[in-house]
C-alpha cells in the first residue's frame, strides 16, 4: 500500500517538525506559530509575539509566546534590560546593591533579592573588592585610622590622648609613658 520513493523532508531535520499534516519549518525568534504549513516542508504562518511576551528560540514550533517576567519590587529588583520579542526581562540590582541568592545552589534563574552594598568608606576602610555579584569586601583602615577591636578608630589629634601600640605604629605616635 505504500510507495517505494520517499520525499526528501522526513521531519528528521532540525528545522522541520510534523505539525498537523505536514513537516513544517519552524518560526524565527520573536514569533509564534499561528498556523502550520499547508504543504510538505513548507513555511508555517508565524506572527510577532504580542507586547509583554517573548520567544527566544530560533526554528521553534511554539504556538504561544512566553509572558515576560516582572522584576520583584519587594526584593528590590530592577529591570536591567527590558523585555523584547526575542528576550525576557533581565532583572538585577541597582548600583550600590548586590544579588543575594535565596537558594544554596545559585544559578542565573534562581530567585534572589537585592541587598545594599557595604560602604567601606563609612567604615573608614579601603574597598578591596567592589560590590557587584556579592557584597563589598573591605580591606585595611584608611590612612589616619587604626584597627581597634572590630572597627577603625581615628588617630588622636593631640598627645593628650592615649595611643596604644597599634595606634603608634599606624599613627606615628610614640608611647607617652
Amino acid at each position: 500500500q505504500g510507495g517505494t520513493r520517499s520525499p526528501r523532508c522526513d521531519c528528521a531535520g532540525d528545522f522541520h517538525k510534523k505539525i498537523g499534516l505536514f513537516c513544517c519549518r519552524g518560526c524565527p525568534a520573536g514569533h509564534y506559530l499561528k498556523a502550520p504549513c499547508t504543504e510538505p516542508c513548507g513555511n508555517s504562518t508565524c506572527l510577532v509575539c504580542p507586547q509583554d511576551t517573548f520567544l527566544a528560540w530560533e526554528n521553534h514550533h511554539n504556538s504561544e509566546c512566553a509572558r515576560c517576567q516582572a522584576c520583584d519590587e519587594q526584593a528590590s529588583q530592577v529591570a536591567l534590560e527590558n523585555c523584547s520579542a526575542v528576550a525576557d526581562t533581565r532583572c538585577g540590582c541597582k548600583p550600590g546593591w548586590f544579588v543575594e541568592c535565596q537558594v544554596s545552589q545559585c544559578v542565573s534563574s534562581s530567585p534572589f533579592y537585592c541587598q545594599p552594598c557595604l560602604d567601606c568608606g563609612a567604615l573608614h576602610r579601603h574597598t578591596r573588592l567592589l560590590c557587584s555579584r556579592r557584597d563589598t569586601d573591605c580591606g585595611t583602615c584608611l590612612p589616619g585610622f587604626y584597627e581597634h577591636g572590630d572597627g577603625c578608630v581615628s588617630c588622636p589629634t593631640s598627645t593628650l590622648g592615649s595611643c596604644p601600640e597599634r595606634c603608634a605604629a599606624v599613627c606615628g605616635w610614640r608611647q607617652m609613658f
Epitope: Q1, G3, R5, P7, R8, C9, F22, T38, E39, P40
Partner: antibody, heavy 123, light 111 residues
Framework: EVQLVESGGGLVKPGGSLKLSCAAS????????MSWVRQSPDKRLEWVAE????????YYPDTVTGRFTISRDNAKKTLYLEMSGLRSEDTAMYYC????????????????WGQGTSVTVSS | DIVLTQSPASLAVSLGLSVTISCRAS??????????LQWYQQKPGQPPRLLIY???TVESGVPARFSGSGSGTDFSLNIHPVEEDDSAMYFC?????????FGGGTKLEIK
C-alpha cells in the same frame, strides 16, 4: 471492514446552520486525519475541511473559512462538520473521507469515503 | 490554488479497447521525485473510490487494467482493456498543497 456513515443533512434556509456527523468503524480512528468533501449537483468535487489525527490542527479552503468548523471526538470515533451562514452554493452531497498517509508526513490520499449526506440550502 | 483541468469532459469507448484520460495541473505537483496526484472512480449513487495515488501507484484491490502515469503538470489515467464495469466518472486530485483540489471529472461510457 472500514466504514464511514454520515448523518445530519437536510433542508435549511439561507443563513441557517447544520451539524453533520460521520461515525467511523473498522479502523483506529484516532490515528488518521479526516476530511469532508462535498459534491455539488453539477458533480464537481470540492474539499471543504480537514482535521489532523490528534485534533489539534484544522484546515479549510477560503470558500468556507469562518463559516464551517471541523471537529472530532476520538473516544466516540466520530467526525463533525458544523456549518453556519449557509448559502445556496453550499447545496451538495457531503462526504467524510479517511486520509491515509501514503508517504510519511507528506502525501495524503482519501482511501475510504462514506455514502454521503445531502444538504440543501433553499428558501 | 492549484487548478486541475481534465480532458475530455466525456467520452464513449467500445468494450475491450483502451482509454486515456488526461489531467493537467496549473503548476507542478511534484516534490522530490513524487507526484502528488490521485485518480478516483465514481459510479452513480456511490462515493468516489481511490484507484491510483502518487501518479502511478495502484491502490490495493484495484484491477491491474488501471494504470497512471505522468509527472510535473501532465498526468494520465489509462484503462486497458475497458470493461463494462468501468462506466463511471473519473476525477484527478492533487495533494501537493492545501487546499486539496479536484479536476472537473471525465464521464466514461462503454459502447
Amino acid at each position: 471492514e472500514v466504514q464511514l456513515v454520515e448523518s445530519g443533512g437536510g433542508l435549511v434556509k439561507p443563513g441557517g446552520s447544520l451539524k453533520l456527523s460521520c461515525a467511523a468503524s473498522g479502523f483506529t480512528f484516532s490515528s488518521y486525519a479526516m476530511s469532508w468533501v462535498r459534491q455539488s449537483p453539477d458533480k464537481r468535487l470540492e474539499w471543504v475541511a480537514e482535521i489532523s489525527s490528534g485534533d489539534t490542527y484544522t484546515y479549510y479552503p477560503d470558500t468556507v473559512t469562518g463559516r464551517f468548523t471541523i471537529s472530532r471526538d476520538n473516544a466516540k470515533k466520530t467526525l463533525y462538520l458544523e456549518m453556519s451562514g449557509l448559502r445556496s452554493e453550499d447545496t451538495a452531497m457531503y462526504y467524510c473521507a479517511r486520509d491515509r498517509e501514503a508517504y510519511y508526513g507528506q502525501q495524503y490520499v482519501m482511501d475510504y469515503w462514506g455514502q454521503g449526506t445531502s444538504v440543501t440550502v433553499s428558501s | 490554488d492549484i487548478v486541475l483541468t481534465q480532458s475530455p469532459a466525456s467520452l464513449a469507448v467500445s468494450l475491450g479497447l483502451s482509454v486515456t484520460i488526461s489531467c493537467r495541473a496549473s503548476e507542478s505537483i511534484e516534490y522530490s521525485g513524487t507526484s502528488f496526484l490521485q485518480w478516483y472512480q465514481q459510479k452513480p449513487g456511490q462515493p468516489p473510490r481511490l484507484l491510483i495515488y502518487g501518479s502511478s501507484t495502484v491502490e490495493s484491490g484495484v484491477p491491474a487494467r488501471f494504470s497512471g502515469s505522468g509527472s510535473g503538470t501532465d498526468f494520465s489515467l489509462n484503462i486497458h482493456p475497458v470493461e463494462e464495469d468501468d462506466s463511471a466518472m473519473y476525477f484527478c486530485q492533487q495533494s501537493r498543497r492545501l487546499p486539496w483540489t479536484f479536476g472537473g471529472g471525465t464521464k466514461l461510457e462503454i459502447k
